[in-house]
Amino acid sequence: SQPQAVPPYASENQTCRDQEKEYYEPQHRICCSRCPPGTYVSAKCSRIRDTVCATCAENSYNEHWNYLTICQLCRPCDPVMGLEEIAPCTSKRKTQCRCQPGMFCAAWALECTHCELLSDCPPGTEAELKDEVGKGNNHCVPCKAGHFQNTSSPSARCQPHTRCENQGLVEAAPGTAQSDTTCKNPLEPLPPEMSGTMLM
């Protein structure tokens, strides 16, 4: 009887033992080997011969176990679309791109195809930290108590209010979400708007 250990081997139910590394070839009704990442099919399999694979040429790749007769062309990261390269294309992996700093992915089709500028967060807020940079537009959240942020910016972080006493000063005006504490020398007179107010 026929050997069944390695491809090509007969398949009556049109499924193969190792779905990742083998595929069903319907003309010959057999299971054949896929080509490993970084290669393509240079000669198709038959009942008498397994798939023959060849290495992808320069500037082309195949990422997965495949039965493709060509390799995919490497594509550069398109700066016009706001993308930058983080890893070059290899025979086994496409060029790895990400959004440029200050941008987020606005169009996604298996991978990011178009980045746009991150929205500014107004004073008193900051961008909520995300698991992955560039994945989505900014979601602005108020500064937490004791912190401020005084610009319109996509990336500025809320900073802790200055503690006047740490500098040997006293507080002239309390900090808000949009402004830092105002400190003064303890010997300085009160500002005019506070005259008449008695400091205990």
């Epitope: 003309q27 010959h28 009704r29 008498i48």
Partner: antibody, heavy 120, light 107 residues
């Protein structure tokens, strides 16, 4: 009893078209790959077309690719061969055959054949 | 395409003779070879499959042997009904190809 009966042959002019049929009985037609072969007068046998059990896959040798189309109707237990742009060299007896559906891939049953003559 | 060279193209023999027909493939076809008998005006009939296996209902005087590129059909003792044309077919790799045939005639 397994039976394959071809029909539809005849005389046709070069460039013309013809549709052959093969009526199957005595087995579960939808379980089998089906084939067309042909034999020119006084010559040997030649493979012409293959269709998978469900009809999703079709295959042809270069000699007929783009001119012949194999199809099937599993509900009617019927196999077809649509032939167009016919040439004198397509003159032959056309046979339908069943491919064994185990692991050995031989052709266990053949029809009696239908004659196609391409001549002006 | 795999070329199938069948020999002889014709053969004269007598009832009771032992007859051998050979088929040589252009490359190793891993025993994916079958033999068919055809009588005038009739369809081919399967005799042997997978090089050596006798098809159902075929008399035991027919046998097949061989491997790799070289295959043989043997009829151990010719009977009157055996006078016909015989074809080998490789179905190891598409396109399937037949030998040119051997016409077996009465001497």
């Amino acid at each position: 009893e397994v039976q394959l009966v071809e029909s539809g042959g005849g005389l046709v002019k070069p460039g013309g078209s013809l549709r052959l049929s093969c009526a199957a009985s005595g087995f579960t037609f939808s379980d089998y790959y089906m084939y067309w072969f042909r034999q020119a007068p006084g010559k040997g046998l030649e493979w012409v077309a293959t269709i998978s059990d469900g009809g999703s896959y079709t295959y042809y040798p270069d000699s007929v690719k783009g001119r012949f189309t194999i199809s099937r109707d599993n509900a009617k237990n019927s196999l077809y061969l649509q032939m167009s742009s016919l040439r004198a060299e397509d003159t032959a007896v056309y046979y339908c055959a069943r491919e064994e559906n185990g692991n050995f891939y031989y052709f266990d049953y053949w029809g009696q054949g239908t004659t196609v003559t391409v001549s002006s | 395409d795999i070329q199938m060279t069948q020999s002889p193209s014709s053969l004269s023999a007598s009832v009771g003779d032992r007859v051998t027909i050979t088929c040589k493939a252009g490359q190793d076809i891993k025993s994916y070879l079958s033999w068919y008998q055809q009588k005038p005006g009739k369809a081919p009939k399967l005799l042997i499959y997978y090089a050596t296996r006798l098809a159902d209902g075929v008399p035991s005087r027919f046998s097949g042997s061989g491997s790799g590129t070289d295959y043989t059909l043997t009829i151990s003792s010719l009977q009157p009904e055996d006078f016909a044309t015989y074809y080998c077919l490789q179905h190891g790799e598409s396109p399937w190809t037949f030998g040119g045939g051997t016409k077996l005639e009465i001497k």
